[in-house]
Interface confidence: low
Amino acid sequence: EEELQVIQPEKSVSVAAGESATLNCTATSLIPVGPIQWFRGVGPGRELIYSQKEGHFPRVTPVSDPTKRNNMDFSIRISNITPADAGTYYCVKFRKGSPDVELKSGAGTELSVRAKPSAPVVSGPAVRATAEHTVSFTCESHGFSPRDITLKWFKNGNELSDFQTNVDPAGKSVSYSIRSTARVVLTRRDVHSQVICEVAHVTLQGDPLRGTANLSEAIRVPPFLEVTQQSMRADNQVNVTCQVTKFYPQRLQLTWLENGNVSRTEMASALPENKDGTYNWTSWLLVNVSAHRDDVKLTCQVEHDGQPAVNKSFSVKVSAHPKEQGSNTAAENTGTNERNIY
């Protein structure tokens, strides 16, 4: 005697999220009479996916008309697949009765959902760091399936190697997340640099997703200070120049002090950008030497991006022979420096 078989020809089906999944099922006999039902999972907790008899299943469409008397094809199409639909689906034949009795189940078809990773989001450090320091950038992407994924980091097109990547969860899941942290050593030339996190996944058909972060958000390039004095003018006025160069970001305050007293404070604004993204600024102070009897200590004080102030000082010695005034050499580039000018 020929026994009814329920055949599910595919052991597994893989579908991209948003697409439809077709789950095939054939019953080899019209006898005995009774409905077919589809379940996800096994045992008492299994989930009813489709029933010929009853219920509302808006996303499920039978491939063939199950009401036709001679129908033996009980394949279904599930629309708009999401990662939550992953699992093993069973086509089950029931014998008509009160209640219906489960007769035979197919071997099951595992549905795996290929879900695209979300656009990678790259976040940088909360506070700026200076050149030669190492900063961390984090890249996150979520919601992808299957779990296999490749993540690469680039800085200005060059692949980075110092990074750690985790894919969660470790076990089986309907979808996964990836988190990677890259360590990047900053240089003074990095204002225009960019880090890119590139995620490659089977769902992307060779078109990886990229997330970017600009190092301009993470870097602080402290200024160089150079204080110089021009030749004394005929009217006994000395023009002292404070050159503040190669700094980023633009937020900078410059204060001139004469003998420790604030003479003038200026804020940098609308400065032209250097090719490397940094800024330069020059400030002048005109000092009337004849108005001073004693030496004049001039200090150019620069506060950059909320950092402690950097000072450069000159001691201008009031001379009996002002016309012999020469030009002073630049002060040192660090710390507080004093020069006597004769």
Partner: antibody, heavy 121, light 107 residues
Framework: QVQLQESGPGLVKPSQTLSLTCTVS??????????WSWIRQHPGKGLEWIGY???????YYNPSLKSRVTISVDTSKNQFSLKLSSVTAADTAVYYC?????????????WGQGTLVTVSS | DIQLTQSPSSLSASVGDRVTITCQAS??????LNWYQQKPGKAPKLLIY???NLETGVPSRFSGSGSGTDFTFTISSLQPEDIATYYC?????????FGGGTKVEIK
């Protein structure tokens, strides 16, 4: 409410460089959160996306035009610009500047009124 | 590049009619799709973003649906001021691309 206004010559000779500027008012380019794009429309035809720039200077150009396109930004003037080199009659179009949400959810939610550029000798 | 195929390319309908435009993507773009309205001599105006979300200030007679590769734009009751060309645009992949447009006219 942000407004965008294109400006530049309406006539460009073949082989020369087309230069357009988009001035943004009612919002700051440098506040972030948006891409600043150029889109063009050939007479009686559909829309073609040219590329975008972020306030930081990051750009992406349509590969079909990449070799000829430069988009730049001047945050101090709240402007961004398009340069298209080696133009031909096929570059005759209405050029639009537009603002697009960085997260992609809001589309090009603000556009300029467009400026017609004719390439002819 | 992602191709977006809009259909029909033009249609003529009466005031009060329900108008439906479709946009098919050459590959899965999830719901990363916008719909624009462009009136003659004007810049495009965003109507629908993320396939189904109505942009602020846009009349509720406009709607959108779909996900993956097949999308639909509907005007539930056509008004004279709706005479325009309508474009779909994908932003799932760079470069962003537009559909060829659907010109809507009044009978």
């Amino acid at each position: 409410q942000v407004q965008l206004q294109e400006s530049g010559p309406g006539l460009v000779k073949p082989s020369q460089t087309l230069s357009l500027t988009c001035t943004v008012s009612g919002g700051s380019i440098s506040s972030g959160g948006y891409y600043w794009s150029w889109i063009r429309q050939h007479p009686g035809k559909g829309l073609e996306w040219i590329g975008y720039i972020y306030y930081s200077g990051s750009t992406y150009y349509n590969p079909s035009l990449k070799s000829r396109v430069t988009i730049s930004v001047d945050t101090s003037k709240n402007q961004f610009s398009l340069k298209l080199s080696s133009v031909t009659a096929a570059d005759t179009a209405v050029y639009y500047c537009a603002r697009e949400g960085l997260d992609g959810s809001y589309g090009s939610s603000a556009w300029g009124q467009g400026t017609l550029v004719t390439v002819s000798s | 590049d992602i191709q977006l195929t809009q259909s029909p390319s033009s249609l003529s309908a009466s005031v009060g009619d329900r108008v439906t435009i479709t946009c098919q993507a050459s590959q899965d773009i999830s719901n990363y799709l916008n719909w624009y309205q462009q009136k003659p001599g004007k810049a495009p105006k965003l109507l629908i973003y993320d396939a189904s979300n109505l942009e602020t200030g846009v009349p509720s007679r406009f709607s959108g649906s779909g996900s993956g590769t097949d999308f639909t734009f509907t005007i539930s009751s056509l008004q004279p001021e709706d005479i325009a060309t309508y474009y779909c645009q994908q932003f799932a992949y760079l470069p962003y691309t537009f559909g060829g447009g659907t010109k809507v006219e009044i009978k």
